[in-house]
């Protein structure tokens, strides 16, 4: 009886694992083995596929074959007993195009209200992704174990910290990788769960802001308690992208070590041009807080995000504010080549009650003012990019009196 050649051959490639699966054509014939040959583009001869010779099952692994993953390859299979079937040729394919990204490795660290997630490629020193190692981005799904309500977080790198969690609560998450340059989305990791710790005695500092004054950076933050000391550390932001390396060498800012105020001032030349992460920690001598949320700090934007300059036209019941480009020394306007939004704070001169307007436009109306009343206005600019959430310092306050009644035209 002639042996039929196997059919329906599937090639599965996950990272550097090459798996072949196929169907037997004739289940009634026992003791059949299967063998594969492969052929590279531009070659006439077929070569025996090591790892896939005389296979008794319907699956084999040819990961040991050192292929050029960007080169097209053709496979053929036949069944063997006393005689052999005809060859069945599999459609040619390029391994890199066919490959899927495997599940990443996940390492979790718990704080009281935060989880640090370290993500590494599932296959260390992968041949398949050797040229793409730094291009991996990850997305994750996280949920409280008790509720199951999922939150998705996209476009994260090999280290990510999730804040504003509840203490003593178990959170579960799964992570998958993506290579956006190749339109590849990977397979989810197994689910990992971790319980946040009991609430720490000292909360972390909050609302960290960087501004520029003269040739210095001024770093400010808020803190709940008095009589504390603080330290500030920085890290190059690009180091969060480094796959497989989870030793983050945070550095101290010398002028911000053991400071007793909720701000510190350090020269601009501490940082070369670039994007950094900053974090602050509080201590009362006995206990230490966890680190604050990390803020992104771009020296380019920070250096040029100056407070806006504005003119006020006073009416009886409103101000018209015209925002112009900020001035550098020498009175030349600064060209800001990124979109900004403006925060305008105004208050009655005799009161502390502040009101706020946020506007994208550069001409703003401040409504509902009382006639013949002195109001003060200050403004600052914010970048609209969520990832580079930067703000200028506030401009100096400008105070103007509204006109008498019935001059609103």
């Amino acid at each position: 009886k002639n042996l039929k050649s196997p059919q329906k051959v599937e090639v599965d490639i996950i990272d550097d694992n090459f798996i072949l699966r196929w169907n037997r054509s004739d289940e009634s014939v026992g003791n059949v083995t299967f063998s594969f040959d492969y052929q590279k583009t531009g070659m006439d001869n077929w070569i025996k596929l090591s790892g896939c010779q005389n296979i008794t099952s319907t699956k084999c692994n040819f990961s040991s074959l050192k292929l050029n993953v960007y080169e097209e390859i053709k496979l053929r299979i036949r069944a063997e007993k006393e005689n052999t079937s005809s060859w069945y040729e599999v459609d040619s394919f390029t391994p890199f195009r066919k490959a899927q990204i495997g599940p990443p490795e996940v390492h979790l660290e718990a704080e009281d209200k935060a989880i640090v997630i370290h993500i590494s490629p599932g296959t260390k020193d992968s041949v398949m992704w050797a040229l793409d190692g730094l291009s991996f981005t990850y997305s994750l799904v996280i949920w409280k174990n008790s509720s199951g309500v999922e939150e998705r977080i996209e476009n994260i790198y090999s280290r990510h910290k999730i804040y504003k969690l509840s203490p003593e609560t178990t959170y579960c998450l799964k992570v998958k990788a993506a290579l956006l340059t190749s339109w590849k989305i990977g397979v989810y990791s197994p689910v990992h769960c971790i319980k946040t710790t009991v609430e720490n005695e000292l909360p972390p500092p909050e609302n960290i802001e960087v501004s520029v004054q003269n040739q210095n950076y001024v770093l400010k933050w808020d803190y709940t308690y008095a009589n504390m000391t603080f330290q500030v550390q920085w890290l190059h932001a690009f180091l969060k992208r480094n796959p497989g390396n989870h030793l983050y060498k945070w550095k101290q800012i010398p002028d911000c070590e053991n400071v007793k105020t909720t701000q510190c001032v350090f020269p601009q030349n501490v940082f070369q041009k670039g994007i950094y992460l900053l974090r602050v920690q509080a201590s009362d001598g006995n206990n230490t807080s966890f680190w604050s949320e990390e803020i992104k700090f771009d020296t380019e934007i920070q250096a040029f995000l100056l407070p806006p300059v504005f003119n006020i036209r006073s009416l009886s019941d409103s101000f018209h504010i015209y925002i112009g480009a900020p001035k550098q020394s020498g009175n030349t306007p600064v060209i800001q080549d990124y979109p900004l939004i403006y925060e305008i704070i105004f208050w009655e001169n005799t009161s502390n009650a502040e009101r706020k307007i946020i506007e994208k436009k550069t001409d703003v109306t401040v409504p509902n003012l009382k006639p013949l009343t002195v109001y003060c206005v200050k403004a600052r600019a914010h970048t609209m990019d969520e990832k580079l959430n930067k703000s200028s310092v506030f401009s100096d306050a400008v105070c103007e009196k509204t006109k008498p009644g019935n001059t609103s035209k």
Epitope: L108, E109, L247, N287
Partner: antibody, heavy 118, light 107 residues
Framework: AVQLQQSGAELVKPGASVKLSCTAS????????MHWVKQRTEQGLEWIGR????????KYAPKFQGKATITADTSSNTAYLQLSSLTSEDTAVYYC???????????WGQGTSVTVSS | DIVMTQSQKFMSTSVGDRVSVTCKAS??????VAWYQQKPGQSPKALIY???YRYSGVPDRFTGSGSGTDFTLTISNVQSEDLAEYFC?????????FGGGTKVEIK
């Protein structure tokens, strides 16, 4: 394979200084922290300090500030511990260790015995 | 300053038993705790990092657990080669305090 090879045992006089070395193979010390740890006979482990060989930044336990100086030479892939004004309290085995991922000390040297005696 | 306390200096166990070595931090250290094994006359060897992650090559009878201030190293199915002193350590980017150590003796 990762290895940390420490210099040989030292017998030194009180008041003198000693410099211990720790040569790494199988990895580049610039990519890690290098730590030094003290252990007196039948006692526990005491962290002395660490260096980031990439830029020379050091951190010391308060107790060893002024007593210990940690340096590194990236060209020879070696970390050093210098101990000054030695007393009998400094008699101990000193270990170097690599600070790896997540800051834990994943590989240790075989230790160097320092004996301070007149 | 953070203090790591291993209250039991000695623990006695038998081959095949299960033993738990405990460590208490003086303040919340999250999950930044490592465990080391030091056999007589040898240098320490890393077993566990980040409270519960085992280093490659470490037998799976060694398990780390805990977070915040209370941490445990459990050795299940104790073997004679587990006779050693075990140290916990708080590890993060700027402070590395060791516990006083717990000697595990085999009966």
């Amino acid at each position: 394979a990762v290895q940390l090879q420490q210099s040989g045992a030292e017998l030194v006089k009180p008041g003198a200084s000693v410099k211990l070395s720790c040569t790494a193979s199988g990895f580049n010390i610039k990519d890690y922290y290098m730590h030094w740890v003290k252990q007196r006979t039948e006692q526990g482990l005491e962290w002395i300090g660490r260096i980031d060989p990439e830029d020379g930044e050091t951190k010391y336990a308060p107790k060893f500030q002024g007593k210990a100086t940690i340096t590194a030479d990236t060209s020879s892939n070696t970390a050093y511990l210098q101990l000054s004004s030695l007393t009998s309290e400094d008699t101990a085995v000193y270990y170097c260790a690599r600070g790896g991922n997540y800051y834990a000390m994943d590989y240790w040297g075989q230790g160097t015995s320092v004996t301070v005696s007149s | 300053d953070i203090v790591m306390t291993q209250s039991q200096k000695f623990m006695s166990t038998s081959v095949g038993d299960r033993v738990s070595v405990t460590c208490k931090a003086s303040q919340n250290v999250g999950t930044n705790v490592a465990w080391y094994q030091q056999k007589p006359g040898q240098s320490p060897k890393a077993l566990i990092y980040s409270a519960s992650y085992r280093y490659s090559g470490v037998p799976d009878r060694f398990t780390g657990s805990g977070s915040g201030t209370d941490f445990t190293l459990t050795i299940s199915n104790v073997q004679s080669e587990d006779l050693a002193e075990y140290f916990c350590q708080q590890h993060n980017s700027y402070t590395y305090k060791f516990g006083g150590g717990t000697k595990v003796e085999i009966k």
